[in-house]
Amino acid sequence: SVTVHSSEPEVRIPENNPVKLSCAYSGFSSPRVEWKFDQGDTTRLVCYNNKITASYEDRVTFLPTGITFKSVTREDTGTYTCMVSEEGGNSYGEVKVKLIVLVPPSKPTVNIPSSATIGNRAVLTCSEQDGSPPSEYTWFKDGIVMPTNPKSTRAFSNSSYVLNPTTGELVFDPLSASDTGEYSCEARNGYGTPMTSNAVRMEAVERNVGV
């Protein structure tokens, strides 16, 4: 029987470092090895018939035990599939190796209205583009961490909001007078130093009632 396997199905490595993606196989008399890269809608061939393809040959080397990168960039993050088949036969096996290139978060950008109407919906956003793996976001009001569930803390029990740590979106619905304050957010991805945005003041104002 044939086996294709990697003892490291997930590899995490800081950007600009060398890395090896392992692929061990047995039971093949004349193995033909291919490596495929997948990231979202992108699929590329890294290695075909035991040879590194032209687009990778300057920085990737084929070894009998895997492929080795001289230096990885954030664009290399994705799933690599090692596919082994018998030359001229029908034996086949494959293994997937997930590569996560670690990049610290950059300073997040916030979109916070300077004023919003009490009783209405107010949307605050926080995002940063560099972090790998993608950052999770924590919101602060007047320097105090906002819990995911406002009802869980006395300080926020009068607020009505939904906070999504993955997207960085903070939605007040409805906005109340007590939501006036200085808001900032922090991005962290478990690698490097967490980064904090600028603080922006949001005023919760009464609805203008026409005479």
Epitope: T3, H5, S6, S7, E8, P9, I13, N17, P18, V19, K20, S22, A24, S26, T61, L63, P64, T65, T68, F69, K70
Partner: antibody, heavy 116, light 106 residues
């Protein structure tokens, strides 16, 4: 014949650093990752970390991270493991081992004794 | 991390006896288990990999079986030269050794 030959026994004081070597022969050094495994007295075997000799890429077991450095010299087919800030619990036999998927060939082991 | 629970920690058997050692993984390891023999003052020696594949030159009295989380290593007829400590190793995801089984002769 595949061989992994390690440097001799070491006696070190707490806080010191030790560097162990592992010279290989009988196969292409850069084709296989080289691992280091600790065996403390009366305890089991635990992987410390490894190096891909082709490009110098390393990975360390979280338990040893920060105190261990693994390097390789392709010109001499030799791998090295350096362990710093030694303490009494680092007294152990340290092995280098070649990895295919499991560990198929091992060095003879190097005894490191940490004692004041 | 995957944990490996090896039992027994030691055993005593007579020459010619059948000896069985077990390793239980904390999760399914998909048959990626190896067995090693270590004699005093020596490095571990690979006997079996991928549950039951015998390394070249290893006597056929050594065998392995199992699947999922449960694996067994057997010496069909214990010989005096088999006195050693035996370890299992899971290599499905990173590497974890069992605690070892010391085999002695009665």
């Amino acid at each position: 014949e595949i061989q992994l030959v390690q440097s001799g026994a070491e006696v070190k004081k707490p806080g010191a650093t030790v560097k162990i070597s592992c010279k290989v022969s009988g196969y292409s050094f850069t084709d296989y990752s080289m691992y280091w495994v600790q065996q403390a007295p009366g305890k089991g075997l635990e992987w410390i970390g490894y190096i891909d000799p082709y490009n110098g890429g390393t990975r360390y077991n979280q338990k040893f991270k920060g105190r261990v450095t693994i390097t390789a010299d392709k010109s001499t087919d030799t791998a090295y493991m350096e362990l710093s800030s030694l303490r009494s619990e680092d007294t152990a036999v340290y092995y280098c081992a070649r990895q295919t998927d499991y560990f198929d060939y091992w060095g003879q082991g190097t005894l490191v004794t940490v004692s004041s | 991390d995957i944990q490996m629970t090896q039992s027994p920690s030691s055993l005593s058997a007579s020459v010619g006896d059948r000896v069985t050692i077990t390793c239980k993984a904390s999760q399914d390891i998909n048959n990626y288990i190896a067995w090693y023999q270590q004699k005093p003052g020596k490095a571990p020696k690979l006997l079996i990999h991928y549950t039951s594949t015998l390394q070249a030159g290893v006597p056929s009295r050594f065998s392995g079986s199992g699947s999922g989380r449960d694996y067994t290593f057997t010496i069909s007829s214990l010989q005096p030269e088999d006195i050693a400590t035996y370890y299992c190793l899971q290599y499905d995801n990173l590497w974890t050794f069992g605690q070892g089984t010391k085999v002695e002769i009665k």
